[in-house]
Structures are given as C-alpha cells and as structure tokens.
Amino acid sequence: GNLKHKCFRNSLENNETLESIMNTLESEEDFRKYFYYLEGSKDALLCGFST
C-alpha cells in the first residue's frame, strides 16, 4: 500500500494535476492506461530502486 502510493505520488511531475493529465492525453483509453502504469510501476526510472 504505502510503497505503491509513494511511487504513484512521486510519478507526477511538479506541475501535473489529474486535470492537466486528462486534458493532455489523447484518448480516454490512454488516460486509463497512464494510471495503470503509474500504480506499482516496476521501472527504476519511474519509482527508484526499492527493497
């Protein structure tokens, strides 16, 4: 729970809000996909290494 939440919050860049992301992504499908990627990402570039 906490690790995923931290990863998710750190993923949003400084000026990003849910509204700005929704307005910038090109489809509803991509909006849904984007948050599938943010939640619990395994990519080191996105969330940093964890133990």
């Epitope: 090109e26 991509d30 996909k33 990627y37 570039l45």
Partner: antibody, heavy 124, light 109 residues
C-alpha cells in the same frame, strides 16, 4: 483517434540512405506524454525496434543500429522521420511507425498505435 | 543487451486454452507487453503492463509475468486468434525496446 501514416520510396539502392516519414493525425508529436518510434520487420521475420523520438526532440536508438540511424521531426507538419544510412539488402523490410505513452519523464511504455507499414526493398 | 526468447510455434485445439511464453532474465522486474499480428496487417497491442487488456480486446486474452517468464494465455481459442504473437519490454538500462522473436499460434479444428 490518433492515426499514423508512413510514406517514402519503396525501392532504395544499396549504400544509399533510406528516408521515411510518419505523419501523425489526431494528436501532436510535441505532446510530452507520448513517444514516437520506428519498428521494422524483414520478410518472414520478427519485429525489430529501431529508435524513438520524444516531445522535445530527444532520441534513443537501438544499440545494433545506432551508428546508421537518425530520427528527426518537423513540428510544423506534425511528422517524424527515419533515416537509415549505408543500406544493404538485409535492410529490406516493412517499416512501421508506432506511438506509445511516456510516463513521468523518461519512462517508455507499450506501442499502442501503429501505422499500416510501408514496404522498402533494397536492391540495385 | 537484453534478450527475449519465444518458442516459434504453438498449436491449440479450437476452444481450448493456449499458452505462449516469453523468457527473459528476471523479466518479472519489467513490464511485458504482447502484440498480435495477422498476415499482411500491423501488430495490435493485446496485453500491456503484464496483464492489462486494452479496450476492444476480448476477455479470453490474459497475461501474467513471474520470475523469468511472461505468459500470454488465450482461453477458449477461436479460429480468428490464429496469428503471430510478440512479447516486448523496455530495457531501461539501454533505453531501448526489445521484442521477442515471435510465436505463431495455430488453432486446430
């Protein structure tokens, strides 16, 4: 709906440079949430990723093709292009442009949208 | 560089379950994606981020990723599922996408 369309010569002579263009409609190539790639498929073989360009013009290339590959963009036409130098018959393939989400700065995802592909034959 | 290994072909009886595997060193630490390609057509994304289906992809397609193997399962395979299937990951150390060699799924009967 975002659509991609490849264009370019179908026949290139050995040692020349292959040049292809992908026109994006329904979305912007300067949208920071997306990454635009070139992928090829030799006849009867599998998919090979060649490289990617992102919203600010930054590029990343396949290590095996890096020395011969260049990807650029024309924001005024909403197009991105591939140049592959010193081609040989082994570069004969269907060339696809594809687009995918780019998450949180530098993290690339899948290829959700593809062009229909363009056949390029390298022959004298 | 990172490599993904797929068996060249898999056969399945109509309406039975087909499993297509993709092997890679600790692939579970990466997001695996799967594409379907029918003859003369562009690839289509059928599974992303290990187990998620894009809109419009039938529920019979599912994915998993554990250890050194990612798996695409087609439950109740239909004749129209006969195609080539490719797995793909991003190799973040090389900033490069990597595809598996592809698996041809044959649906018998």
């Amino acid at each position: 709906e975002v659509q991609l369309q490849e264009s370019g010569p179908g026949l290139v002579k050995p040692s020349q440079t292959l040049s292809l263009t992908c026109t994006v409609s329904g979305g912007s190539i300067t949208n920071s949430y997306y990454a635009s790639s070139w992928i090829r498929q030799p006849p009867g073989k599998g998919l090979e990723w060649m490289g990617v360009i992102i919203y600010d013009g930054s590029t990343y290339y396949s290590p095996s093709l890096k020395s011969r590959t260049s990807i650029s963009r024309d924001t005024s036409k909403n197009q991105f292009s591939l140049q592959l130098s010193s081609v040989t018959p082994e570069d004969t393939a269907v060339y696809y442009c594809a687009r995918g989400l780019r998450v949180a700065g530098s993290y690339f995802t899948d290829f959700g949208t593809w062009g229909q592909g363009t056949q390029v034959t390298v022959s004298s | 560089s990172y490599e993904l290994t797929q068996s060249p072909s898999v056969s399945v009886a109509l309406r039975q379950a087909a499993k297509i595997t993709c092997g890679g060193d600790n692939i579970a630490s990466k997001h695996a994606h799967w594409y379907q390609q029918k003859p003369g057509q562009s690839p289509v994304l059928v599974i992303y981020k290990d187990s998620n289906r894009p809109s419009g992809i039938p529920e019979r397609f599912s994915g998993s990723n554990s250890g050194n193997t990612a798996t695409l399962t087609v439950s109740g395979a239909q004749a129209e599922d006969e195609a080539d299937y490719y797995c793909q990951v991003w190799d973040s150390s090389a900033n490069a996408a990597v595809f598996g060699g592809g698996t041809h799924l044959t649906v018998l009967g």
